[in-house]
């Protein structure tokens, strides 16, 4: 029994004066607590607690369930205990079958013994199955068997407490271990879409998916730079004992322009936190913005190909697109497609493929696009570069030599005189008159130039060359002169193409 200094309160004394007492089932338990300030006896086993205000605790016919710790307490709060085993060969274990563990923590299999003298007190797997190799335990006859550092893999493990009695193995009722997992990583969060574009009045709904090992993960939607509590709806699934999924859906039933901003889905557990954001842009009405991918003024050589390409942003989705030339709509030769397959895509591409363009096919090509809110258009001015063509080359009645050439860009006409039989006409002749004539063709067509020289300047036989040229090429026409006496004649004019 404990001894204390005189004058200090001392704990009660118990008879019999030992820490453990073994009695047989059916025998009497008689415990006496001696203390002038006696308050109560308390009996504890598993989750059961009983009290007795008598200083003598008497159980006439002891049962296995009377096994447990008997504590006597005095008015100073000091106490003394004795542990009583009620040996019952038919009931070797007292059990509380609830068995819960936290991953990486110890947990107690509550199967205290009624007989401390049995041997090989341990755990066994159900139906003869072996326990996990790494499972470590410490037996304590008064409390049960402590499993050390519970693993996630032990979840749903079926086991028995076991002892050897008279050479035979005796098993308790079965226990099923339920393990609550520890968080060993941050939650995995994802969002249904990274950005949303809406018109005023439309519903905004975005879903955040949170995945973790258990439902105790915390999650919330937050508006960046705002403390306003957002209305969320949750759904969840237990895809497995350690595979939990929550969907947190944020809804604004009628979005306004000032709802635009960044929304964050935030999740945390005891390991750490994770977040993902989505951007909402609310516009008062739809829009279309067109961006030409090439210059809107296009120069192309005769017979070559050109692609007119636009990118455009359209919200809501484009409904009608067309390419127009000279009030005619193209039914083919063009394609229109989204810039990306992303669900949030608002950017599109339209391409008109013009092949082997003729000089007569210059002009304004217009792309038109519309959606339910707006229309938009862009025009391309296409100029077809053509080498000059000499339309007329004549000697006029007034003695003038006239050369008319057409082409694009505007041709330049130069005159040369070749005396005698020389092949090369190098001596240039200044024109008397040069005019750019209005073309009768469509706009963006060939430009017509007329140039004249005075033939009276020529005193010898020879050839006059009219050379029309531009960036694309050149063409020449020739006038042959022969003098008969004092008369000058124009002999058959002819043209010669010089590439």
């Amino acid at each position: 029994q404990p001894s204390v200094s005189p004058g200090e309160p001392s704990p009660p004394s118990i008879h019999p004066g030992k820490s453990d007492l073994i009695v047989r089932v059916g025998d009497e338990i008689r415990l006496l607590c001696t203390d002038p300030g006696f308050v109560k006896w308390t009996f504890e086993i598993l989750d059961e607690t009983n009290e007795n205000k008598q200083n003598e605790w008497i159980t006439e016919k002891a049962e296995a369930t009377n096994t447990g710790k008997y504590t006597c307490t005095n008015k100073h709060g000091l106490s003394n205990s004795i542990y009583v085993f009620v040996r019952d060969p038919a009931k070797l274990f007292l059990v509380d079958r609830s068995l819960y563990g936290k991953e990486d923590n110890d947990t107690l299999v509550r199967c205290p013994l009624t007989d401390p003298e049995v041997t090989n007190y341990s755990l066994k797997g159900c139906q003869g199955k072996p326990l996990p190799k790494d499972l470590r335990f410490i037996p304590d006859p008064k409390a049960g068997i402590m499993i050390k550092s519970v693993k996630r893999a032990y979840h749903r493990l079926c086991l028995h407490c076991s002892v050897d009695q008279e050479g035979k193995s005796v098993l308790s009722e079965k226990f099923i271990l339920k393990v609550r997992p520890a968080f060993k990583a941050v939650p995995v969060v994802s969002v249904s879409k990274a950005s949303y574009l809406l018109r005023e009045g439309e519903e905004f709904t975005v879903t955040c998916t949170i995945k973790d090992v258990s439902s105790s993960v915390y999650s919330t939607w937050k508006r960046e730079n705002s403390q306003t509590k957002l209305q969320e709806k949750y759904n969840s699934w237990h895809h497995g004992d350690f595979n939990y999924e929550r969907q947190a859906t944020l809804t604004i039933s009628s979005a306004r322009v000032n709802d635009s901003g960044v929304f964050m889905c935030y999740a945390n557990n005891t390991f750490g936190s994770a977040n993902v954001t989505t951007t909402l842009e609310v516009v008062d009405k739809g829009f279309i913005n067109i961006f030409p991918m090439i210059n809107t003024t296009v120069f192309v050589n005769d017979g070559e190909n050109v692609d007119l390409i636009v990118e455009y942003e359209a919200f809501p989705k484009p409904e009608h697109q067309q390419w127009i030339y000279m009030n005619r709509t193209f039914t083919d030769k063009w394609e229109d497609y989204p810039k990306s397959e992303n669900e949030s895509n608002i950017r599109y591409v339209s391409e008109l493929h013009l092949t082997r363009l003729k000089g007569t096919e210059g002009g304004t090509y217009t792309f038109l696009v519309s959606n339910s809110d707006v229309n938009a258009a862009i025009a391309f001015n296409v100029y077809v570069n053509t080498k000059p063509e000499i339309l007329t080359y004549d000697r006029l009645v007034n003695g003038m030599l006239q050369c008319v050439a057409a082409g694009f860009p505007e041709p330049t006409i130069d005159w040369y005189f070749c005396p005698g039989t020389e092949q090369r006409c190098s001596a240039s002749v200044l024109p008397v008159d040069v005019q750019t004539l209005n073309s009768s063709g469509p706009p963006f067509g060939k430009l017509v130039v007329q140039s004249s020289i005075d033939s009276s300047a020529f005193k010898h036989n020879g050839t006059v060359e009219c050379k029309a040229y531009n960036d694309v090429g050149k063409t020449s026409a020739y006038f042959n002169f022969a003098f008969k006496g004092n008369n000058k004649e124009q002999i058959h004019p002819h043209t010669l193409f010089t590439p």
Partner: antibody
């Protein structure tokens, strides 16, 4: 010993409000998810709302969404259900139920219930 | 939402007889996340079976559960007078959590 004690029920007119409480004892309240389940007179069980033990998830049946709010005060070991815009069909015994240790939505302990009557 | 349909609505049997209660789900209940509860008159429900077939601590072994996917069964191997109650199945795989309509077990 686990105990759950509901209170706050009573007679209320349609459109009115009530706040139910559930006082918990005998276990570490903050370690467990909790739910409210109701039972209309002579009818079956209907899950109403749940709250995670970290407070990290609040769930509602469609029939009460937007009208009822679940909350908890771990310092007081108490679960609450704020019920607004009450309707006749909300008349029921309301039970608070404790999740099992290892999994939410599975209930190993229930209170005795509190009766809510919505009538004019 | 997973809808649970219980049958029969009422089961009347003599003591000692075998009672078989059925619970059918509108879609698969993954991982056998299905429970059975017993509710006696004037009392709250009591958990009997979870994981479709695991008996809760303290539940007599005459109660057993079986099944997976969409079809589940609660069996009382030898009906006792104290088993008179309404029995509910419940899925806890996904929210909203749902209960079956219940089967009333009576003694004939």
């Amino acid at each position: 010993e686990v105990q759950l004690l509901e209170s706050g029920g009573g007679l209320v007119q349609p459109g009115g409000s009530l706040r139910l409480s559930c006082a918990a004892s005998g276990f570490t309240f903050s370690d467990y998810g909790m739910s409210w389940v109701r039972q209309a007179p002579g009818k079956g069980l209907e899950w109403v709302s749940a709250i995670g033990y970290g407070g990290g998830g609040k769930y509602y049946a469609d029939s009460v969404k937007g009208r009822f709010t679940i909350s908890r005060d771990n310092s007081k070991n108490t679960l609450y259900l704020q019920m607004n815009s009450l309707r006749a069909e909300d008349t029921a015994v309301y039970y608070c139920a404790k999740d099992t240790w290892w999994l939410a939505g599975l209930f190993d302990y229930w209170g005795q219930g509190t009766l809510v009557t919505v009538s004019s | 939402e997973i809808v649970l349909t219980q049958s029969p609505g009422t089961l009347s049997l003599s003591p000692g007889k075998r009672a078989t209660l059925s619970c059918r789900a509108s879609q698969s209940v993954s991982n056998s996340y299905l429970a059975w509860y017993q509710q006696k008159p004037g009392q709250p429900p009591k958990l009997l079976i979870y994981w479709a077939s695991t008996r809760e601590s303290g539940v007599p072994d005459r109660f057993s559960g079986s099944g997976s996917g969409t079809d589940f069964t609660l069996t009382i191997s030898s009906l006792q007078a104290e088993d008179v109650a309404v029995y509910y199945c419940q899925q806890y795989y996904s929210t909203p959590l749902t209960f079956g309509g219940g089967t009333k077990v009576e003694i004939k």
